[in-house]
Structure formats: C-alpha cells, structure tokens
C-alpha cells in the first residue's frame, strides 16, 4: 500500500517540516496534493521517475526529493505562510 | 452524468487479452481509469483528455472516444498482478 506520516502535525512559526510518503507498490509515479477545507485537491509536486520531479500548480513554499522509487517526502518550508491544510500523497504505475 | 462500465465481472486465463468499457450519454472533459486492489485505495492509472486519444502504459492501452462519451481499457497478455477492480471516473 501507500503510507503517509505523521497523521497530524503542528508546526512552529518559521520551521520546516517534512511529511513522509512511502509506497511498496512498485509504482513509478508519485504525487503530493493539498486540500483546503471544502476545496478539491491541488497538485503541489509530482515525480514520474527516480531522480526527477516537477512542480504542480502550487509548488511555492514546498520542496520534495525522489531518491528512491518507494519514497517521496514533502517538505513544507518556512516560506509557506499558510501551511494549514490536509495533505494527500498518491502513487500510480 | 452516470458512467456505465461493462462487463461487471471478468475472469480470464493468464496471457489472454481483455477489454473493459466505460460509457455515458454525456460528454466528459476528461476520464480517469483507476485500479483498486482489495483493502487498498484506488490507484490512478491514467487520465484521457482529448477525443480519439490513445494512451499506452506498458501492457495497458486506454482509448477515449471521439465524442468524449466513452472510453476503453485494453490489457494485453494479462498477468496475475492485473487482478483487481477497474474503475472509470469523470
């Protein structure tokens, strides 16, 4: 399956926090979305192959890495002034 | 805007080809195909956007009808790993 952690996270002002996303499905593609209350999903970053990732619609204030097929961590940087949201990770073949 | 999928159930031998269909009376700007394995969330396989579009994903071929009302998923030489629930969404 695909696993995200932590389930809940509080961030101190000016801090960077990293959300983990791991999958054991052998999927090449991984995605990070942000969902604000009452809104749909908005794409932050996506990766279709190891060692490569591309910006989605709202990449400002976020960073990612894809060093392994199984893992696609998302860092919410201190530059993201409005980080409060529901974050979803997805994968596909 | 109801989407109808057929067939509802399909059981085939390894190595055989199969096609599943997704039809609607309405026009869709895009259609998505998902695969869901028991106890897991649906996994997005592909999004088709352009009428008449064909997308290939390894042994999977997706087609979007010219009128953007129907789509098909064709699997060549099916393997046991292809077992699952295939969902069409728009």
């Amino acid at each position: 399956g695909i696993t995200q952690s932590p389930k809940y996270l509080f961030r101190k002002e000016g801090q960077n926090v990293t959300l983990s996303c791991e999958q054991n499905l052998n999927h090449d593609a991984m995605y990070w979305y942000r969902q604000d209350p009452g809104q749909g999903l908005r794409l932050i970053y996506y990766s279709q192959i190891v060692n490569d990732f591309q910006k989605g619609d709202i990449a400002e204030g976020y960073s990612v890495s894809r060093e392994k097929k199984e893992s696609f961590p998302l860092t919410v940087t201190s530059a993201q002034k409005n980080p409060t949201a529901f974050y979803l990770c997805a994968s596909s073949i | 805007q109801l989407l109808e999928q057929s067939p509802q159930f399909l059981s085939i031998q390894e190595g055989e080809n199969l096609t599943v269909y997704c039809n609607s009376s309405s026009v869709f700007s895009s259609l998505q195909w998902y695969r869901q394995e028991p106890g897991e969330g649906p996994v997005l396989l592909v999004t088709v956007v352009t009428g008449g579009e064909v997308k290939k994903l390894k042994r999977l071929t997706f087609q979007f009808g010219d009128a953007r009302k129907d789509s098909s998923l064709h699997i060549t030489a099916a393997q046991t790993g292809d077992t699952g629930l295939y969902l069409c969404a728009g």
């Epitope: 052998n26 090449d28 593609a29 279709q48 192959i49 190891v50 060692n51 490569d52 591309q54 910006k55 097929k69 073949i93 | 592909v46 999004t47 997308k55 290939k56 994903l57 390894k58 042994r59």
Partner: antibody, heavy 120, light 107 residues
Framework: EVQLQESGPELVKPGASVKMSCKAS????????MHWVKQSHGKSLEWIGY????????NYNQKFKGKATLTVNKSSSTAYMELRSLTSEDSAVYFC?????????????WGQGTSVTVSS | DIVMTQSPASLSMAIGEKVTIRCITI??????MNWYQQKPGEPPKLLFS???TLRPGVPSRFSSSGYGSDFAFTIENMLSEDVADYYC?????????FGAGTKLELK
C-alpha cells in the same frame, strides 16, 4: 506520422559552441518529452537529458551538466540543444528522441541524428 | 547511475539460428527494460518497451523476457536483415542508461 527532423552536420573549432535543432511533426509537441542522446563513433549510446516542452522542465545527466543546454520553441515545435566549450571528445552523432510524458516511456521515435565534428 | 552489463559484445550467427542477448543490472529495475536495434547510418529503433511490450510492426520472431535485474532479448530464427547493433536501456531511473551494445553479424 511522427517525424523528428534534425539540423545538418556541423564542423566546429575546439572551444566553440554549437546549437542543433530538432523539428517535430505528426503529434502534439507539448504532450511528449524530448530527449537527446550522444553516440560517439563506433560506441554505445549516452543519455544527455530531456526537456518537457509543456513547462520547460529539464533533467540532465550529471555528466553533461554545464556542457549541454536544452530549450524548445513551442510555436515552431522545435527542440534545441546547445553544446559549449567543445573538445574532440564531443565529436559524435547527436540524436533527439521523444517519449510520452505519462508514463515515463523509453524513446520511441528518433531523429536521423546530427553529426558534430570538433577539429582545428 | 544504474550500470547495464550487456553480453556478448559481438555475435556471429547463421541464418535460422537462435540469438540471445542478455542485460544484467546492478539494481532491481522491475520490468523497466527496453531493447533497441540500430543499423548502420540509422537511428536506434525501439523493439521492446517496458513490460516486455513488443512495439507495433516488430516481427514476432523477436521476444523479450526478464524482471528485476536479469533480462534477455531473443531472435528465434535469425534472418539476414537482423544484422545490426542491439542495445538495452533501463527506464526505471534517471539518468537513463544503455548497455554497451551487441554487434550481431552473419556467419
């Protein structure tokens, strides 16, 4: 029918730069990645990098960072590769080749190649 | 980078013989292996893409197998038109990497 038409052969001096082109037709240029591959005489193939013409995203083989620059002109459906600070090691045939964006496929259509000779 | 070990480097076969080329990777690449044929003065031609998928128009005497780190490309009954260089390519990981190639000649 998908076609990739590359520019003609180049004879350049060491230290100079060269910019080659690859004109795409027969498909929607912005839908697919454009890759560049090097083949030295009698040798294997080396992947240089790719560009996504839709958003200009590039990814380079570390070996070619600083050597190659990939760009596109969407209005003319043309991809370009510039090679700088040329040495005899850069003498080779360079291919452009496309791959679909989703999923990340291998290159399925290739240009005929551009021959670059670096000589004083 | 994923290193691709392709063997043999060259091969001399008679018409009708079975040809097998192998490619071994240092890490598991699932089924993200591709095979190309290149004839003199021409660009490479994709024969098999990821998942051992035969490309349109490629003769059925060609086959591809393997998963993980050990892959094979086979020509069942060699014809004179199969004389060419053959390359494997992994598309699991950037940078994409090719095997060193196999030169197939006629005996």
């Amino acid at each position: 029918e998908v076609q990739l038409q590359e520019s003609g052969p180049e004879l350049v001096k060491p230290g100079a730069s060269v910019k080659m082109s690859c004109k795409a037709s027969g498909y929607t240029f912005t839908d697919d990645n454009m890759h560049w591959v090097k083949q030295s005489h009698g040798k294997s193939l080396e992947w240089i990098g790719y560009i996504n013409p839709n958003n200009n995203h590039t990814n380079y083989n570390q070996k070619f960072k600083g050597k190659a620059t990939l760009t596109v002109n969407k209005s003319s459906s043309t991809a370009y590769m510039e090679l700088r600070s040329l040495t005899s090691e850069d003498s080779a045939v360079y291919f452009c080749a496309r791959s679909t964006v989703v999923p990340f496929y291998a290159m399925d259509y290739w240009g005929q190649g551009t021959s670059v000779t670096v000589s004083s | 980078d994923i290193v691709m070990t392709q063997s043999p480097a060259s091969l001399s076969m008679a018409i009708g013989e079975k040809v097998t080329i192998r490619c071994i990777t240092i890490t598991d690449i699932d089924d993200d292996m591709n095979w190309y044929q290149q004839k003199p003065g021409e660009p490479p031609k994709l024969l098999f893409s990821e998942g051992n998928t035969l490309r349109p128009g490629v003769p059925s005497r060609f086959s591809s197998s393997g998963y993980g780190s050990d892959f094979a490309f086979t020509i069942e009954n060699m014809l004179s038109e199969d004389v060419a260089d053959y390359y494997c390519l992994q598309s699991d990981n950037l940078p994409l990497t090719f095997g060193a190639g196999t030169k197939l000649e006629l005996k």
